[in-house]
């Protein structure tokens, strides 16, 4: 949950690619005004996930989840929260 | 804002060598089945995507990272 809060559109696109869901990918890419060549590039990546099957998608999803919830990222998220709190306090 | 570790993972997936990408994944999930899968996906992407495709994917990622939705 925390990781999706840091950049929800990135995780929308990543999981659409990894799930092999073309419709979902199109919807996500529309949100960032992707050009046709950009869509083509993402669909080539999606093809690799589809060709390698369900286990492949699950394993790569596991990698992304693990990195996103690692101390490298969680430390970053905590730091950002601290900075936000400081700014909010200064702004009052 | 996207986490730098995630950004590095995606950058290496697109522009790194298979060894570089898998070594990076291994820092987070050192399971043979996961690492073999990561290499298979990386090899597939390298074979399917032209340099132009990779540039387009990187430009899309820039849009994602700078989007208000990120």
């Amino acid at each position: 949950v925390k990781m999706a809060e840091t950049c929800p559109i990135f995780y929308d696109v990543f999981f659409a690619v990894a799930n092999g869901n073309e419709l979902l990918l199109d919807l996500s890419l529309t949100k960032v005004n992707a050009t046709e060549p950009e869509r083509t590039a993402m669909k080539k990546i999606q093809d690799c996930y589809v060709e390698n099957g369900l286990i492949s998608r699950v394993l790569d999803g596991l990698v992304m989840t693990t990195i996103s919830s690692s101390k490298d990222c969680m430390g970053e998220a905590v730091q950002n929260t601290v900075e936000d709190l400081k700014l909010n306090t200064l702004g009052r | 804002e996207i986490c730098p570790a995630v950004k590095r993972d995606v950058d290496l997936f697109l522009t790194g060598t298979p060894d570089e990408y898998v070594e990076q994944v291994a820092q987070y999930k050192a399971l043979p089945v996961v690492l073999e899968n990561a290499r298979i996906l990386k090899n597939c992407v390298d074979a399917k995507m032209t340099e132009e495709d990779k540039e387009n994917a990187l430009s899309l990622l820039d849009k994602i990272y700078t989007s208000p939705l990120c």
């Epitope: - | 070594e23 050192a30 043979p32 073999e36």
Partner: antibody, heavy 123, light 107 residues
Amino acid sequence: QVVLVESGGGVVQPGRSLRLSCAASGFTFSSYGMHWVRQAPGKGLEWVAVIWYDGSIKYYADSVKGRFTISRDNSNNTIYLQMNSLRAEDTAVYYCARALIPVAGTDPIFGYWGQGTLVTVSS
Amino acid sequence: DIQMTQSPSTLSASVGDRVTITCRASQSVSSWLAWYQQKPGKAPKLLIFKTSGLESGVPFRFSGSGSGTEFTLTISSLQPDDFATYYCQQYNTYSPTFGQGTKVEIK
């Protein structure tokens, strides 16, 4: 790019010893398990031994257990195969191979190979 | 040790042919199977791992399939550079074993 260079092969009498070396470059040596694989003249491939990325664990084929010892020097990016009590059936080209996938416990998939060094055991 | 048996031992084919090599394991190796290509006087080269995963730089005309005890390597359209000996290898155990090899020669 990954480069593996074996050396130390030659002609040796049965019962004698020989030490093979494999110098590695072009990759993060200390992250990968390393193997020796051999091929008798005109025959197929036979896995010989593996050493973990940090040298902590070693496995051997039954045919060489107790006679061969694999070791590595991560500061010099080199692995070794100490071969004792050599037999005629040990005659082969010995290849050094890098594991495809990094870190410990990874599967024995041979991603990169050296050019091989010939060991001939003959009286 | 798990025994790996390849068939045929020798295969005569022409450029453009579709070629299939079979590899059987004496017991299940799940999907932990690799294929290598070797040319005379050269070291083997990894083509495929985990049954169907193409290694970097290997052309798409090579493909692998199977699971358990029966596996195949297929070359969809044989090229002059493909005449070589092919080996399967299981890595289900930490005592990896190879098939005896299949030599693909010019008809």
